[in-house]
Interface confidence: low
């Protein structure tokens, strides 16, 4: 048993451009608090898996009001450590999630409103009893600086908090065969209760005579590292001659998962999938309740209605999973009609509608041509929500009010001269060229390049572009 301790040093804008706006304002003062979730192992766990090592919520920080015009500074923090007690052995490797929450202190009825400002996660190796480890994590434009450590609760000692220590029975020495408990030199190792030979570093026991292995170790005495090699069989104790693993018991043999948990082998060890109400490396810890803080992202925790469901998390909009840890992509349901752009704002969905459409889900088709007249014989065309006029020849512009100069774009190639005509434009080609736009050179022998000149027109004649 022991305690994981987290000390938040600062939370504020990270380096670089794009500093975030202060989360608080004079109109809406706020304060911060933090939440930490710990899971054993370095393996990528399912996002909704519970905080099997434990979770903790900080106190609220001091009330902060933004100074108008000032950039967001490091925000005032809650006092004290976040402490996550662990009842089992410290696993040595762990995953963490740290959430920074904002509590708005407006005048809304019914208490403050909470919103998640930032969420960082990582996987680390850490020996219990070691010094504070410092860390910096960034979430968007925010930066979180913190330190953490794991310490054993007496009488446990060691890197996994699995060795037990007791005060010396005599001032001068420990009992026969028992060593002093470094660094607690005034204490002695407790009498051996685990199976004889059980590795003090990699094994632990909760009952006399047993030897249970920490993640990454196997064998009856937890002395065999679980490794992958080029050998055919990835199991069993190491062969002294080849250095390879020879066939032997698999990590799931005998099912190390208690309380109906199911075991699956991983490259380094095994993993237990626990039934609801149990957690821990081997599903050995029971009774997850709302007091353990299993619901994330503002999920509402309520005690289950029967013994098989110790708690139920009811998730806020945008989150799902048994612990509200999985973000829902509500836009994947394509709620916006008529090509509208879906925006998931977390607290709500918004649809940004294309021109010509309106409504919360862009469901209303506006009549683009209603009340719109196209001048000079043009006709109104609805398309893609945008009003457009199809203009009669010789007219252009949005409403066909502009007289079109067909020659304005200089359509005649190779020095051809352009003449406006009631039905369009006519190009008078320079010598040596022909075609509607004077685009085809005339060969010296009088033959034209493809396509041929239409019958009845000599090369060099004005070409009418219809």
């Amino acid at each position: 048993a022991g305690v994981f301790e987290l000390q938040i040093h600062s939370f504020g804008p990270g380096p670089g451009p794009g500093a975030p706006r202060s989360p608080c304002s004079a109109r809406l003062p706020c304060r911060l608090f933090f939440r930490v979730c710990l899971k054993p192992g370095l393996s990528e766990e399912a996002a909704e898996s519970p905080c099997a090592l434990g979770a903790a919520l900080s106190a609220r920080g001091p009330v902060y009001t933004e100074q108008p015009g000032a950039p967001a500074p490091d925000l005032p923090l809650p006092d004290g450590l976040l402490q996550v007690p662990f009842r089992d052995a410290w696993p040595g490797t762990f995953s963490f999630i740290i959430e920074t929450w904002r509590e708005e202190l407006g005048d809304q009825i019914g208490g403050p409103a909470w919103s998640l400002l930032a969420r960082v996660a990582g996987r680390r190796r850490l020996a219990a009893g070691g010094p504070w480890a410092r860390d910096i994590q960034r979430a968007g434009a925010w930066e979180l600086r913190f330190s953490y450590r794991a310490r054993c609760e007496p009488p446990a000692v060691g890197t996994a908090c699995t060795r037990l220590c007791r005060p010396r029975s005599a001032p001068s020495r420990c009992g026969p065969g028992l060593r002093p408990c470094a660094p607690l030199e005034d204490e002695c190792e407790a009498p051996l209760v685990c199976r004889a030979g059980c590795s003090p570093e990699h094994g632990f026991c909760e009952q006399p005579g047993e030897c249970r292995c920490l993640e990454g170790w196997t064998g009856p005495l937890c002395t065999v590292p679980v490794s992958t090699s080029s050998c055919l069989s990835p199991r069993g104790p190491s062969s002294a001659t080849t250095g390879c693993l020879v066939p032997g018991p698999g990590p799931c043999d005998g099912n190390p998962c208690a309380n109906g948990g199911s075991c699956s082998e991983t490259p380094r060890s095994f993993e237990c999938t626990c039934p609801r109400g149990f957690y821990g490396l081997r599903c050995e810890v029971s009774g997850v309740t709302c007091a353990d803080g299993p619901c994330f992202n503002g999920g509402l925790c309520v005690g289950g209605a029967d013994p098989d469901s110790a708690y139920i998390c009811h998730c806020p909009p945008g989150f799902q999973g048994s612990n509200c840890e999985k973000r829902v992509d509500r836009c994947s349901l394509q709620p916006c009609r008529n090509g509208g752009l879906c925006l998931d704002l977390g607290h709500a969905l918004r649809c940004r509608c294309r021109a010509g459409f309106a409504g919360p889900r862009c469901e209303h088709d506006l009549d683009d041509c209603a009340g719109r007249a196209c001048a000079n014989g043009g006709t109104c065309v609805e398309g893609g929500g945008a009003h457009r006029c199809s203009c009669a020849l010789g007219f252009g512009g949005r409403d066909c009010r502009e007289r079109a100069d067909p020659c304005a774009a200089r359509p005649c190639a190779h020095g051809g001269r352009c003449y406006a005509h009631f039905s369009g434009l006519v190009c008078a080609c320079a010598p040596g060229y022909m075609g509607a736009r004077c685009e085809f050179p005339v060969h010296p022998d009088g033959a034209s390049a493809l396509p041929a000149a239409p019958p009845g027109l000599r090369p060099g004649d004005p070409q009418r572009y219809l």
Epitope: G110, W114, A291, G298, L300, V302, G303, H314, P317, P360
Partner: antibody
Framework: QVQLQESGPGLVKPSETLSLTCTVS????????WSWIRQPPGKGLEWIAY???????NYNPSLKSRVTISLDTSKNQFSLKLSSVTAADTAVYYC????????????WGQGTMVTVSS | EIVMTQSPATLSVSPGERATLSCRAS??????LAWYQQKPGQAPRLLIY???TRATGIPARFSGSGSGTEFTLTISSLQSEDFAVYYC?????????FGGGTKVEIK
């Protein structure tokens, strides 16, 4: 500040179905859990049911067989239907919003009195 | 279901005095408890949630304490507007249940 307004008939005959609607004054109906609570004259409060925009519902087991709760996000409304009513269902019916971090009720409608009588 | 029992049913207190209201759960509800105030002809108003956290806008004279099965609402110095009926409510288990109420009246 969001406001809730109950509406529906004040008098229902025995064995008929009581139907009430609660209108939410803003567009927050997709962001919260919504509930119905009732209070018989001179008595205490009884939770009836709640609904969430995703369709998740929960009912008081004592009323579950007779209650239906539904929600219409396009109209910012949620509704209650209580079938086979008797005189014991005479009460002030409140709609309320569930608080974000716990199933307490932070915003209430003013209540509507429903009398079951022939 | 969890039965919430409030005592006393009626509490007679003079303005300026301290009022202590009790709420007991038939089984542990952790800290998942709320307190409400209801005046005649009005809807209840949330005072306390999480057993001890005051809702926004609630005066500091209202305080809540307790966890598990025993809870207390204390009004340190009763004002004229505090005379009302007070209800506790648990939200630890289904169904959500309320206490029978304590009426605080002028002595």
């Amino acid at each position: 500040q969001v406001q809730l307004q109950e509406s529906g008939p004040g008098l229902v005959k025995p064995s008929e179905t009581l139907s009430l609607t609660c209108t939410v004054s803003d567009n927050s109906i997709s962001n919260y859990y919504w509930s119905w609570i009732r209070q018989p004259p001179g008595k205490g409060l009884e939770w009836i049911a709640y609904i969430y925009y995703s369709g998740t519902t929960n009912y008081n087991p004592s009323l579950k067989s007779r209650v239906t709760i539904s929600l219409d996000t396009s109209k910012n409304q949620f509704s209650l239907k209580l079938s086979s009513v008797t005189a014991a269902d005479t009460a002030v019916y409140y709609c309320a919003r569930l608080f974000n971090w716990g199933f307490a009720f932070d915003i209430w409608g003013q209540g509507t009195m429903v009398t079951v009588s022939s | 279901e969890i039965v919430m029992t409030q005592s006393p049913a009626t509490l007679s207190v003079s303005p300026g005095e301290r009022a202590t209201l009790s709420c007991r759960a038939s089984q542990s509800v952790s800290s998942n408890l709320a307190w409400y105030q209801q005046k005649p002809g009005q809807a209840p108003r949330l005072l306390i949630y999480g057993a001890s956290t005051r809702a926004t806008g609630i005066p500091a004279r209202f305080s809540g304490s307790g966890s598990g099965t025993e809870f207390t609402l204390t009004i340190s110095s009763l004002q004229s507007e505090d005379f009302a009926v007070y209800y506790c409510q648990q939200y630890n288990n289904w169904p959500l249940t309320f206490g029978g109420g304590t009426k605080v009246e002028i002595k």
